[in-house]
Interface confidence: low
């Protein structure tokens, strides 16, 4: 049975086996086509989601689709039902929390009262002044909190207590990539992890431990990527994995927060990377223990310089490392998070690509998660 499962796939009606390598090859080998059903699927970027959260205290903003202008949500008459609608628009299914926060001196958007229409937030037509003088601070999911805060700089062994959202993504029980838990159903990783194996069956997710082999595997229901853009082959290196059964959160299994839409990190901002990747470039072996390292944002202009990536780093990517090299992600770390800590931990990047590992002028290049928030929300909404 184990050998059969490893090398063959069972078609139904009529029952017969086909070689597993014929799964997800674009050809219908089973009469009913089930060999092409459970494959990595692409999902277009889709329309703009009409709600978003700002880094200014996670305040809610709503889009007026008629004008294309964004407005800040006034706390007047804001209800739990409206909070749930806002979060559902972003694809969250969990119970949100919200509170009033004072309108700050730097408030640059008009503040309007919010109502609901067809399960979408709208601006109240006859909206007067925001009498409460407060905005809506909204949290769709409790995220980004760990039991332990990393304190050191440089590279060292990590504890799952510090990074409870880190998962190992495995094919045929072999670690291939890292990933991050975003909510009970969803794991964020890199699309390039699935280039070689596009069938969903043999992919598993392992969560809740900092040691590679020591935790139970979770079945994957779906793997979703963005349509491949041949003009920018390194772009869109992002994937979402939907788990077959929702995770039960604990001290060692928790979600990380998505970044805010306006999370612009300046050069030298401290960030963290984690992974079980290769510990020596061009060889070595996968680390059995989760490793963590502190890095910093590296200016895209510097990263695109003639002695570096010569323009290959697009606006949907970001560079991170340390200026003289030596601390970087490497093979096997792909898909893992590049993290920023404010009040909570946010996954601002996904380990994507780079030339070598730890070179001084060629730092790690990461998928910029804030550039794909719309896509993530649209995927989640479609799967609600």
């Amino acid at each position: 049975k184990v050998i059969l499962d490893k090398y063959y796939f069972l078609c139904g009606q009529p029952l017969h086996f086909i070689p597993r390598k014929q799964l997800c090859d674009g050809e219908l080998d089973c009469p009913l086509g089930e060999d092409e059903e459970h494959c990595v699927k692409s999902f277009p970027e889709g329309p703009a989601v009409a709600v978003r959260l700002s880094k200014d205290r996670s305040t809610l903003q709503v889009l007026d689709s008629a004008t294309g202008n964004w407005f800040s949500a006034c706390f007047d008459n804001f209800t739990e039902a409206l909070a749930e609608t806002a979060c559902r628009q972003m694809g969250y299914s969990s119970k949100p929390t919200f509170r009033a926060v004072e309108i700050g001196p730097d408030q640059d958007l008009d503040v309007v009262e919010i109502t609901e229409n067809s399960q979408e937030l709208r601006m109240r037509n006859s909206s007067g002044p925001c009498l409460s003088g407060s905005l809506v601070s909204l949290h769709c999911l409790a995220c980004g909190k760990s039991l332990k805060t990393p304190r050191v700089v440089g590279v060292e062994e990590a504890s799952v207590d510090s990074w409870p959202w880190q998962v190992s993504i495995q094919y045929d029980k072999q670690h291939v990539c890292g990933g991050s838990i975003l909510d009970p159903h969803w794991v964020l990783t890199a699309a390039h992890c699935f280039r070689k194996h596009t069938d969903v069956f043999n992919w598993k997710v392992r969560a809740g431990s900092d040691k590679l082999g020591s935790f139970p595997s979770l079945a994957v229901a779906k793997i979703i990527i963005i349509e491949f853009n041949p003009m920018y082959p390194k772009d869109n290196d992002i994937a979402l994995m939907k788990l077959q059964f929702p995770l039960t959160f604990s001290g060692t299994v928790r979600p990380i927060c998505l970044p805010f839409f306006d999370e612009e990190l300046t050069p030298a901002t401290p960030l963290w990377i984690i992974g079980w990747g290769f510990t020596k470039q061009n060889g070595g072996k996968m680390s059995d223990i989760l490793l963590q390292a502190s890095v910093q944002v590296i200016d895209s202009t510097r990263c695109n310089a003639d002695d570096a990536y010569q323009g290959e780093v697009t606006e949907k990517m970001m560079c991170a490392g340390i200026p003289e090299g030596g601390v970087d992600t490497c093979q096997g770390d792909s898909g893992g998070p590049l993290m920023y800590q404010s009040d909570q931990w946010h996954v601002v990047g996904i380990v994507s690509w780079g030339y070598g590992c730890g070179g001084p002028s060629t730092p790690g290049v990461y998928t910029k998660v804030s550039a794909y928030l719309n896509w993530i929300y649209n995927v989640w909404k479609a799967e609600l």
Epitope: Q296, P323, E324
Partner: antibody, heavy 121, light 107 residues
Framework: EVQLLESGGGLVQPGGSLRLSCAAS????????MHWVRQAPGKGLEWVSS??????YYADSVKGRFTISRDNSKNTLYLQMNSLRAEDTAVYYC????????????????WGQGTLVTVSS | DIQMTQSPSSLSASVGDRVTITCRAS??????LAWYQQKPGKAPKLLIY???SLQSGVPSRFSGSGSGTDFTLTISSLQPEDFATYYC?????????FGGGTKVEIK
């Protein structure tokens, strides 16, 4: 060879100003965090200030009086010192951060030869 | 701020002696400690970083150890050129702070 050369030190009266410069060579200056460290005569080492990208950091003893800056096109680090006091008398060293970790931490290597600032009436 | 306490403040030793200098941090700094050597009229020189990593070009008779709050610099066999003042420095957070120094003199 990596080299750092400080200049601009001298005798100044209390309340006066001075601008120190540190010329760097032998490395990509703009990619590195840079520091000023001082040493009063016969005393130990005291960190003064650091600069990285757009971030600047200062010791409490100089905050509001000293300003660190850099000109990457000229490979030069500066320390503008205003409202000088007698206790600012020291040899001022410019040093590079070897950047073995994130900003907010690090050691100093190499160091310049130092420039003496004397604040006295 | 993290305080760094070095001891002894001075010591007398002979060529060939094994010399140990200790440094204590007021809070846990993991392994983020550096050691410097300074000779009169000269700039300091980095000897050890990350508590125990020897800076390139530094003789192997120098070694560092420790983690957390307690650290040690050891010179296994003191040479004439090692008579100098030694400083420890915490490298984990601003403000970066140094120990008061240990002057190693000829006995």
């Amino acid at each position: 060879e990596v080299q750092l050369l400080e200049s601009g030190g001298g005798l100044v009266q209390p309340g006066g100003s001075l601008r120190l410069s540190c010329a760097a060579s032998g490395f990509t200056f703009g990619a590195y965090v840079m520091h000023w460290v001082r040493q009063a005569p016969g005393k130990g080492l005291e960190w003064v200030s650091s600069i990285s990208g757009g971030s600047t950091y200062y010791a409490d003893s100089v905050k509001g009086r000293f300003t660190i800056s850099r000109d990457n096109s000229k490979n030069t680090l500066y320390l503008q010192m205003n409202s000088l006091r007698a206790e600012d008398t020291a040899v001022y060293y410019c040093a590079r951060h070897p950047v073995r970790g994130v900003i907010g931490a690090g050691w100093f290597d190499p160091w310049g030869q130092g420039t003496l600032v004397t604040v006295s009436s | 701020d993290i305080q760094m306490t070095q001891s002894p403040s001075s010591l007398s030793a002979s060529v060939g002696d094994r010399v140990t200098i200790t440094c204590r941090a007021s809070q846990n700094i993991s392994r983020w400690l550096a050691w410097y050597q300074q000779k009169p009229g000269k700039a300091p020189k980095l000897l050890i970083y990350a508590a125990s990593s020897l800076q390139s070009g530094v003789p192997s008779r120098f070694s560092g150890s420790g983690s957390g709050t307690d650290f040690t610099l050891t010179i296994s066999s003191l040479q004439p050129e090692d008579f100098a003042t030694y400083y420890c420095q915490q490298a984990i957070s601003f403000p970066l702070t140094f120990g008061g120094g240990t002057k190693v003199e000829i006995k």
